[in-house]
Interface confidence: low
């Protein structure tokens, strides 16, 4: 018979054969042959691999690091990574918790409407017209657009709720 | 390595005076942001005060704003907090926190604490 160019799910192809892969939790050993079924060992303490896969060597479990304010959530298994979140009162960096914050900082755009306390996060509110932040902070208010009338001085570009306005000299040239 | 260590915590009756000190080695303090923290029993960490590496701005928590004082000394690598008019609420653990700045605190590193009991 013809041999294979494609291998049906939780299979792969290797030297003109579909081989199984190995499931979620294992690693591995050798592939297949004619005679023989792959062949796939557990995954050590402390380590995990989530998918069907041909995979020689299984990952490390994620280490949450106490030093940035991290603990474990969820424990790792065999088919899972260990899920890291923050000490209470602390927020995580990004989607994947690598680090800690002890409070969220609103965006450019937005200011802090409330400071987090010890069991709430920062609160954050769009700047209004009039208003603007340039930075991230977890603790800086909207600040309102310079007024350029009091200094004698006229709008030579407008605000926006991330920028200032610009002000600049008054046009002498009048008919 | 960073280290921190606090000292000068104790019981003190409401109304009374404490002053915390922080010691830190292991790291360039003068350019280090720092801020204490604190720790209620049962509660979360708490905000109390932060003074930056630029100039030594400080920021302080609105529940001890008027009564406590942040400082620091970068020729003793050392930071202060000048606790007064203390309340049974202000009773906690207090912890000596570097950041990466004083706009995005971030954990960091902190030390074990310094227990502050206000009891009549």
């Known amino acids: 018979p013809e041999p294979p160019t494609a291998c049906r799910e939780k299979q792969y192809l290797i030297n003109s054969q579909c081989c199984s892969l190995c499931q979620p939790g294992q690693k591995l050993v050798s592939d297949c042959t004619e005679f023989t079924e792959t062949e796939c060992l557990p995954c050590g303490e402390s380590e995990f691999l989530d998918t069907w896969n041909r995979e020689t060597h299984c990952h490390q479990h994620k280490y949450c690091d106490p030093n940035l304010g991290l603990r474990v959530q969820q424990k790792g298994t065999s088919e899972t990574d260990t899920i890291c979140t923050c000490e209470e009162g602390w927020h995580c960096t990004s989607e994947a918790c690598e680090s800690c914050v002890l409070h969220r900082s609103c965006s450019p755009g937005f200011g802090v409407k409330q400071i987090a306390t010890g069991v709430s996060d920062t609160i954050c509110e769009p700047c209004p017209v009039g208003f603007f932040s340039n930075v991230s902070s977890a603790f800086e208010k909207c600040h309102p657009w310079t007024s350029c009338e009091t200094k004698d001085l006229v709008v030579q570009q407008a605000g926006t709720n991330k920028t200032d306005v610009v002000c600049g000299p008054q046009d002498r040239l009048r008919a | 390595e960073v280290q921190l260590v606090e000292s000068g915590g104790g019981v003190v009756q409401p109304g009374g005076s404490l002053r915390l000190s922080c010691a830190a080695s292991?790291?360039?303090?003068?350019?280090?942001?720092m801020g204490w923290f604190r720790q209620a029993p049962g509660k979360g960490l708490e905000w109390v005060a932060y003074?930056?590496?630029?100039?030594?701005?400080?920021d302080y928590a609105d529940s001890v704003k008027g009564r406590f004082t942040i400082s620091r000394d970068n020729a003793k690598n050392t930071l202060y907090l000048q606790m007064n008019s203390l309340r049974a609420e202000d009773t906690a653990v207090y912890y000596c926190?570097?950041?990466?700045?004083?706009?995005?605190?971030?954990?960091?590193?902190r030390g074990q604490g310094t227990l502050v009991t206000v009891s009549s």
């Open positions: 292991g790291f360039t303090f003068s350019s280090a942001t």
């Open positions: 926190v570097t950041m990466r700045s004083i706009r995005n605190p971030d954990f960091g590193s």
């Open positions: 003074i930056s590496s630029v100039g030594g701005g400080t």
